[in-house]
């Protein structure tokens, strides 16, 4: 805590500028008016303050806004955002996507901190749902964002937002999450033709039921083995040898290399040996 002392003559800050770099901590406390700081927050980020100095500036803002900062200040926090605690952020009401983007920019290139997680949570709760623009923004900064949400949270994602999802955004999703996302994706892409539809739906197929896999097998999709290996075991087991052959097309030969791994292993054990032999891969049921 910086001791309260009178500002020396001639040192009262009239604007937030580079001269403040050379103010001692107590001078910043005594000579910088909190209201001036709030109106000129955009300048703070352009000045190379130490974090020790930023602590003093944060303290001044905290005194001015004990109930939480207004969005006009939050949007221009810049590096000062890194000094905020999750408790500070829980007091905020962030509604503008521009504000969210500005703060995520400070954190760019780094994994999600508790501060950022809290900020995103406040923002999404304020909006009531994960709309497309928000999801676009969040997955641009954090490709794994979607997979960090619980199935309950994912249920608030409208199907229209699924268009913003890229394959890499789903890399770390588990089957429970894909179970929620797949029906939304199916709805979102329902008006696309066969080959285009498959390209879009492919990343979500870890949540697909048996009947949808059967339908895909009739469309010459040539599913690759990596996608097949991510399918739900319970969805794969009822597929016939002929259906799997049609589903995989030329990739069917890859089954041999995966015969000891799920879901291939479990599927092989469910098939008649005569049917497996038709593949000519030497698979043993």
């Amino acid at each position: 805590e910086v001791e309260k002392t009178a500002c020396p003559s001639g040192k009262k800050a009239r604007e937030i500028d580079e001269s403040l770099i050379f103010y001692k901590k107590w001078e910043l406390e005594a000579c910088v008016d909190a209201a001036l700081l709030a109106t000129q927050m955009d300048r703070v980020n352009a000045i190379p303050f130490t974090y020790e100095q930023l602590d003093v500036l944060k303290h001044k803002l905290d005194e001015l806004y004990p109930q939480g900062y207004p969005e006009s200040v939050i949007q221009h926090l810049g590096y000062l955002f890194l000094k905020m605690s999750p408790e500070d952020i829980r007091k905020w009401n962030v509604t503008s996507l521009e504000t969210l983007k500005a703060l995520l920019e400070v954190n760019k290139g780094h994994e999600m901190s508790p501060q950022v997680a809290t900020l995103i949570d406040r923002f999404v709760k304020g909006r009531g749902q994960l709309d497309k623009d928000t999801l676009d923004t969040l997955t641009a900064f954090y490709p794994g964002y979607l997979c960090s949400l619980s199935p309950e949270e994912l249920s608030s994602v409208p199907p229209s937002s699924i268009w913003a999802v890229r394959p890499q955004d789903l890399d770390t999703c588990d089957p429970r999450q894909l179970d929620v996302l797949y029906p939304k994706a199916r709805l979102a892409f329902q008006n696309m033709n066969g080959s285009e539809y498959f390209v879009k739906i492919q990343s979500f197929l870890g949540g697909a039921p048996t009947e949808d896999l059967k339908a895909l097998s009739q469309q010459n999709v040539s599913m690759d083995l990596a996608t097949f290996m991510k399918l739900r075991t319970d969805a794969v087991l009822p597929l016939t040898v002929a259906e799997v052959q049609k589903l995989l097309g030329p990739h069917v030969e890859g089954l041999k290399a995966e015969e000891r791994h799920r879901p291939v292993r479990d599927w092989i054990l469910r098939q008649r040996q005569d049917d497996l032999d038709t593949l000519g891969l030497g698979l043993q049921g």
Partner: nanobody, 126 residues
Framework: QVQLVESGGGVVQPGRSLRLSCAAS????????MHWVRQAPGKERESVAT????????YYADSVKGRFTISRDNSKNTLYLQMNSLRAEDTAVYYC???????????????????WGQGTLVTVSS
């Protein structure tokens, strides 16, 4: 954890020059800004020169303007302070400080802070 080590201090006569160095244990590209800060006996620390590494701009306290020059060598991960026309009032322990762009370790979520060296003593005396 980044370490900063200052060197180059010593006893010098008024009007003479000294060059201080601050070697960082890791890449200085991790920092937003680097600073030379001094503390005279019985006084509070004061910043004398700052470099904004992103914007590549330099700032000086009025008391040293025109006499001190801050610079850095990225390839050596070293910050320098060239001090000319030294005066008795420049006597102090000189510290190097650095403000990181972000937490030094992935996943670190404790308080973000500046890194400081242990200081090097500069005595200006006839």
């Amino acid at each position: 954890q980044v370490q900063l080590v200052e060197s180059g201090g010593g006893v010098v006569q008024p009007g003479r020059s000294l060059r201080l160095s601050c070697a960082a244990s890791g890449s200085i590209s991790k920092f937003r800004s680097m600073h030379w800060v001094r503390q005279a006996p019985g006084k509070e620390r004061e910043s004398v020169a700052t470099i904004d590494l992103g914007a590549n701009t330099y700032y000086y306290a009025d008391s040293v303007k025109g006499r001190f020059t801050i610079s850095r060598d990225n390839s050596k991960n070293t910050l320098y302070l060239q001090m000319n026309s030294l005066r008795a009032e420049d006597t102090a322990v000189y510290y190097c400080a650095a403000a990181p762009k972000w937490y030094s370790d992935p996943g670190q979520s404790d308080d973000l802070h500046d890194y400081w060296g242990q200081g090097t003593l500069v005595t200006v005396s006839s």
